[in-house]
Amino acid sequence: LNTTILTPNGNEDATTDFFLTSMPTDSLSVSTLPLPEVQCFVFNVEYMNCTWNSSSEPQPTNLTLHYWYKNSDNDKVQKCSHYLFSEEITSGCQLQKKEIHLYQTFVVQLQDPREPRRQATQMLKLQNLVIPWAPENLTLRKLSESQLELNWNNRFLNHCLEHLVQYRTDWDHSWTEQSVDYRHKFSLPSVDGQKRYTFRVRSRFNPLCGSAQHWSEWSHPIHWGSNSSKENPFLFALEA
């Protein structure tokens, strides 16, 4: 089973200039080799994937993952019960909803079972790692001759999410975007009846219930208005 490791928004791609430079190379042993970083995301508070780059290991190694919650009733060390694999090597762990406690400090420990001293422990705030599902059921209604209202649904507690609406006409080269708070509706006050509009929305777990940086996927687009005779190649490229 091959897993896809999520790196949303393309802003997490720094290479780690790790610290073999700070130690004499002749003194390196297996236990001093750094372990890969663990990155966790909580998907719609339904499950959580904690993944690592298994290919960074000098030789294929089935690293093991343990976790617990600091200062809580759930502070007993737990073994990963559902590993994710990449080319038959462990590359992640999936935790189910009942194992996710958003507002307690999550502690995750990666270990090399062949070299138990080779371990790394990280602490995470899960409320900052929630990625909601994309908004669904986009609907448009006309409020007046020139005003449109866009509505949508989220499969989550609505007050926890903020939203970003993008829209464009088939004459536009770029999207216009507008931030929307937890109310999940957006009004466009002046619509040109001669143009075809495309709308899409994404959501983020911020700022009331967490401080997540990552947005959901974009919703399926929804269209309004007549097809224009001017075909814009940008529109088709962005919808692909």
């Epitope: 997490e12 720094a14 610290f19 372990l35 990155q39 371990q119 995470l124």
Partner: nanobody
């Protein structure tokens, strides 16, 4: 390569405050997870406070509510404000840094840190 230099240690009475500073040179603090650790005589080195470059900070149970970590990227420095010091806080305090790829990575394991300062002695008398 990162060089770390701690300052601000000393001998104080129980209940007093101290502020430790850690100045980094050799590179900026961006994309560095930072940590404060301490080692008392005859004991293992233990984490005190750790911070990811995304801004999440975590404290050891024993110092939560008394110690405060802060970071000044412009000055390439991190600080540990220690209030209500107790004799059991007596230790050598070390600043540590680890280059990380992810904004959320905050290591509480000392062996995950690449770079270390020389340490600052903090002694709390009763």
């Amino acid at each position: 390569q990162v060089q770390l230099v701690e300052s601000g240690g000393g001998l104080v009475q129980a209940g007093s405050s101290l502020r430790l500073s850690c100045a980094a040179s050799g590179r900026t603090l961006s994309r560095l997870a930072m940590g404060w650790f301490r080692q008392a005589p005859g004991k293992e080195r233990e984490f005190v406070a750790v911070n990811s470059w995304g801004g999440d900070t975590f404290y050891a149970d024993s110092v939560e509510g008394r110690f405060t970590y802060s970071r000044d990227n412009a000055k390439s420095a991190v600080y540990l404000q220690m209030n209500s010091l107790q004799p059991e806080d007596t230790a050598v305090y070390y600043c540590a840094a680890a280059p990380t790829s992810f904004a959320t990575t905050a290591y509480s394991s000392s062996n995950s840190y690449a770079y270390w300062g020389q340490g600052a002695q903090v002694t709390v008398s009763s």
